[in-house]
Amino acid sequence: NADGLKEPLSFHVTWIASFYNHSWKQNLVSGWLSDLQTHTWDSNSSTIVFLCPWSRGNFSNEEWKELETLFRIRTIRSFEGIRRYAHELQFEYPFEIQVTGGCELHSGKVSGSFLQLAYQGSDFVSFQNNSWLPYPVAGNMAKHFCKVLNQNQHENDITHNLLSDTCPRFILGLLDAGKAHLQRQVKPEAWLSHGPSPGPGHLQLVCHVSGFYPKPVWVMWMRGEQEQQGTQRGDILPSADGTWYLRATLEVAAGEAADLSCRVKHSSLEGQDIVLYWEHHSSVG
């Protein structure tokens, strides 16, 4: 994918609200282009913080101001509403509400939108077409919550428009504005190390790959041209500079490490794979 983000592309906003007791609460709001955080919400000033120079996409200042106002009102409204109905809904303090909403793009076309609310980490209600529906497993509490949420039809209409119209328009503008950043190619660095000993007479070999962008990468321990199926890939982890880090490990008998190598394939290397040989690896550190 030319823009360095895996299909389907998504933009979503997450709202995590913690209710400690009737009067003490806090919230975290963030905006994400796939797995890249692009926005955050400053609760003190009730403003959207743009984390990348291109995070405004092609929206005007006026549009951003209106969205800020809407988010501010809805945040206040949500807090007040949840606090008001907490007892009726049998929400027991302390509890957490998580909301995620956004849209997906497939081959440049909108493939869908979503808005889901979870209570204590479990699916509770979701927004479908133009109204809130309970998850069947969530029971009567969720049904009652939907009844409350669906009282304001105009609010639901605007929510529907934000998901089906504003969000897809925003993604396209964001991709265009961030093209240079999202299409960049950053070469990985790789190095080898010992992992914690898995047992007597065995070694854990670790191949570290860091500083690469975009995210898709292939890392494998090899013996000659043969891939070692025992290779364990960790999660691809984000670095503070927007690049990625990955480690791949392999457990072997001490005498079988000599002709092993770690091979790294990445789009930035243009076919020139990085190959590091364990026998050349310095055991210092």
Partner: antibody, heavy 116, light 107 residues
């Protein structure tokens, strides 16, 4: 900047119908709703209803369900209100207004006079 | 439907002075109230929404407060251009309804 340009004044006979327009500019038409409000001299303001241009769904005040029909054309960023079976009670100024968190921007109004 | 009772229906005040208008809803409207300024021959103007949030470019002489069923709107340091009719609107659920209006005159 946001602008709502309404069509000109209408003079109609009792029993006739009129269709007025509201052309929107300066914003993304499909993100917002379009509302209509009636103002009669010494009668105050009445909310007629709204259309969501994105989904074409409508919500009406019960008092106007059989009187007003709201439509929208996304290709021309224009909302319309059709008033049928006109009587002298329908003589008023009709405003269109953009809806988001509430009705924030309004048109200049279309005056309708029903007279025989 | 929710009824909005606005008072007074008219008032007269001096330049530089302060006026307050109230709206009482027939039931709790959860702070979903807006205030508008109507002037003859001009499109209406939204001044305040969600009880106390000022629209961009509206001077801070305008303010709003309230909760539940009782809401108020004030203009301080009155200026000649404030001569207008002011309306409250509730938009908590459908149908939205307006107050009867308050005509403001300058002494």
């Amino acid at each position: 900047q946001v602008q709502l340009q309404q069509s000109g004044a209408e003079l109609a006979r009792p029993g006739a119908s009129v269709k007025m327009s509201c052309k929107a500019s300066g914003y993304a038409f499909s993100t917002y709703t379009m509302h209509w409000v009636k103002q009669r001299p010494r009668q105050g303001l009445e909310w007629i209803g709204y259309i969501n241009p994105n989904s074409a769904s409508t919500s009406y005040n019960e008092n106007f369900k059989d009187k007003a029909t709201l439509t929208a054309d996304k290709s021309s960023n224009t909302a319309y209100m059709h008033l049928s079976s006109l009587t002298s009670e329908d003589s008023a100024v009709y405003y269109c207004a953009r809806g988001f968190y509430t009705m924030d921007y309004w048109g200049q109004g279309t005056s309708v006079t029903v007279s025989s | 439907d929710i009824q909005m009772t606005q008072s007074p229906s008219s008032l007269s005040a001096s330049l530089g002075g302060k006026v307050t208008i109230t709206c009482q809803a027939s039931q709790d409207i959860n702070k979903y109230i807006a205030w508008y300024q109507f002037k003859p021959g001009k499109g209406p103007r939204l001044l305040i929404h969600y009880t106390s949030t000022l629209q961009p470019a509206i001077p801070s002489r305008f303010s709003g407060s309230g909760s539940g069923r009782e809401y108020s709107f004030s203009i301080s340091n009155l200026e000649p251009e404030d001569i207008a009719t002011y309306y409250c609107l509730h938009y908590d659920n459908l149908p939205w309804t307006f107050g009867g209006g308050t005509k403001l005159e300058i002494k």
